[in-house]
């Protein structure tokens, strides 16, 4: 018998510790950093992944501003507070009692304040625009082939319901993937667009979160699609609240 048969791993999250101590001795995996039990049949929430990643380099992601309500993450990595379901808590604070409010993908959406700062609710990021530039190729990709391949990727690799991939735009060498998911649209068991975007971002950077699976090998009609830069724009259901000086 192979030793691999006799141990536990989490196919969807390698940043876990797993052992057969779940109900009935089933495999149970806990996220590093938080010890929270994760469901390995789906993506792990970004909050738990960020918590597990705290020892990683600082340049987590870059955000740009498509309109006056979009957020840019100038703060880099931080050790987030997650709720029992693994979602970001609306209010985040650092060790020096500086606090701020975040959206559902953990990006700051208010000015920083002190412990008296109130964040009444976790505001949902309902629209994500993933902006990619691919490396030069002999010719442009066929738009419909590219569209189909990216939709397949989000459905099969990230388990995101196809209805949440709103559009795939292409103007060589720029590809834009639009993800949309309102609170009312997200049913129990649905993968969150924020988590899918985070897994995709890590894949594109060659930092796959999947256990033992090869890195992302994107091909359109057999032609490799190699991404050379990624920008992700986040839009919240309620516009952020920053003072004018920002």
């Amino acid at each position: 018998h192979t030793a691999a048969q006799d141990n536990c791993t989490c196919p969807t999250n390698k940043m876990t510790v797993c052992s057969p101590d779940g109900p009935g001795g089933r495999c149970q995996c806990r996220a590093l950093g938080s010890g929270v039990a994760v469901d390995c049949s789906t993506l792990t929430s970004e909050c738990l992944l960020l918590k597990a990643r705290m020892s990683a380099p600082k340049n987590a992601r870059t955000l740009v501003r498509p309109n006056e309500h979009a957020l840019v993450d100038n703060d880099g990595l931080y050790d987030p507070d997650c709720d029992p379901e693994g979602r970001f808590k609306a209010r985040q604070c650092n060790q020096t009692s500086v606090c701020w409010c975040v959206n559902s993908v953990g990006v700051r959406r208010t000015d920083k304040g002190d412990l008296s700062l109130r964040c009444d609710e976790l505001v949902r990021t309902h629209h994500i625009l993933i902006d990619l530039r691919h490396r030069p190729t002999a010719g442009a990709f066929n738009h419909s082939d590219l569209d189909a391949e990216l939709r397949r990727l989000f459905r099969e690799r990230y388990r995101l319901h196809p209805k949440f991939v709103a559009a795939v735009h292409y103007e060589q060498p720029t590809i834009q993937i639009e993800l949309r998911q309102n609170t009312s649209q997200k049913a129990a068991g649905d993968v969150d667009i924020g988590d899918a975007a985070y897994y995709f971002e890590r894949d594109v950077k060659g930092e796959s979160l999947f256990q033992g699976r090869g890195g992302l090998d994107l091909r359109v009609r057999g032609e490799p699609l190699q991404v050379e830069r990624t920008l992700i724009y986040y839009l919240d259901e309620i516009p952020p609240k920053f003072s004018m000086k920002r």
């Epitope: 048969q5 006799d6 057969p20 101590d21 779940g22 001795g25 039990a37």
Partner: antibody, heavy 115, light 112 residues
Framework: EVKLVESGGVLVKPGGSLKLSCAAS????????MSWVRQTPEKRLEWVAS???????YYPDSVKGRITISRDFARNILYLQMTSLRSEDTAMYYC?????????WGQGTLVTVSA | DIVMTQSPLTLSVTIGQPASISCKSG???????????FNWLLQRPGQSPKRLIY???MLDSGVPDRFTGSGSGTDFTLKISRVETEDLGVYYC?????????FGSGTKLEIK
């Protein structure tokens, strides 16, 4: 050597309550998932309750609300609290240590529910 | 609930001869985590059940290698290459992939 010793099984009237105990030794109790399994007089085996390492509890619908699994880490004892007992709860109750299933079994304690 | 159907109900075997027990589940036991939570247990007369095999084919420590577990999905088999006296008793299959966990009704192995 893993050792599980159940106790507390008695004759009880329908509607009554009972608390079973299982003394565990020979392994790290706090790191282990544990369960209770019962065997009816007809020799049918039935899963009754499980508790994970993180102390999450799991029950089949047939006993939910009437049965509670818990443990005492200081004394290395697993418990099964049973209330509103019925004649169909009559069985030999086994405590198990779990690893990919019910890996180790105790000798059992007999619970008889009868008027 | 997942029904585990064992066959035969009784198996009469001569010492030294092979034996085979089947267990079929009402649904695939392959879990989303890639594991198949399927066990074989033996309850000797007057004793508690004892696990022989877990994850379909993995032998528990101290279990003789004349026992072999195989199968996948919904069909599982326990084979004993040469039956010995200590093998008599009731064999149960178990699934832990779906809640609630369920057992087969048992196969009684008796010596001919």
């Amino acid at each position: 050597e893993v050792k599980l010793v159940e106790s507390g099984g008695v004759l009880v009237k329908p509607g009554g309550s009972l608390k079973l105990s299982c003394a565990a030794s020979g392994f790290t109790f706090s790191d282990s998932a544990m369960s209770w399994v019962r065997q009816t007089p007809e020799k049918r085996l039935e899963w009754v309750a499980s508790i994970s390492r993180g102390d999450d509890t799991y029950y089949p619908d047939s006993v939910k609300g009437r049965i509670t699994i818990s443990r005492d880490f200081a004394r290395n004892i697993l418990y099964l609290q049973m209330t509103s007992l019925r004649s169909e709860d009559t069985a030999m109750y086994y405590c198990t240590r779990d690893r990919f299933g019910f890996a180790y079994w105790g000798q059992g304690t007999l619970v008889t529910v009868s008027a | 609930d997942i029904v585990m159907t064992q066959s035969p109900l009784t198996l009469s075997v001569t010492i030294g001869q092979p034996a085979s027990i089947s267990c079929k589940s009402g649904q695939s036991l392959l879990d989303s985590d890639g594991k198949t939570y399927f066990n074989w247990l033996l309850q000797r007369p007057g004793q508690s059940p004892k696990r022989l095999i877990y994850l379909v084919s993995m032998l528990d420590s101290g279990v003789p290698d004349r026992f072999t577990g195989s199968g996948s999905g919904t069909d599982f088999t326990l084979k004993i290459s040469r039956v010995e006296t200590e093998d008599l008793g009731v064999y149960y299959c178990w699934q832990g992939t779906h809640f609630p966990f369920t057992f087969g009704s048992g196969t009684k192995l008796e010596i001919k």
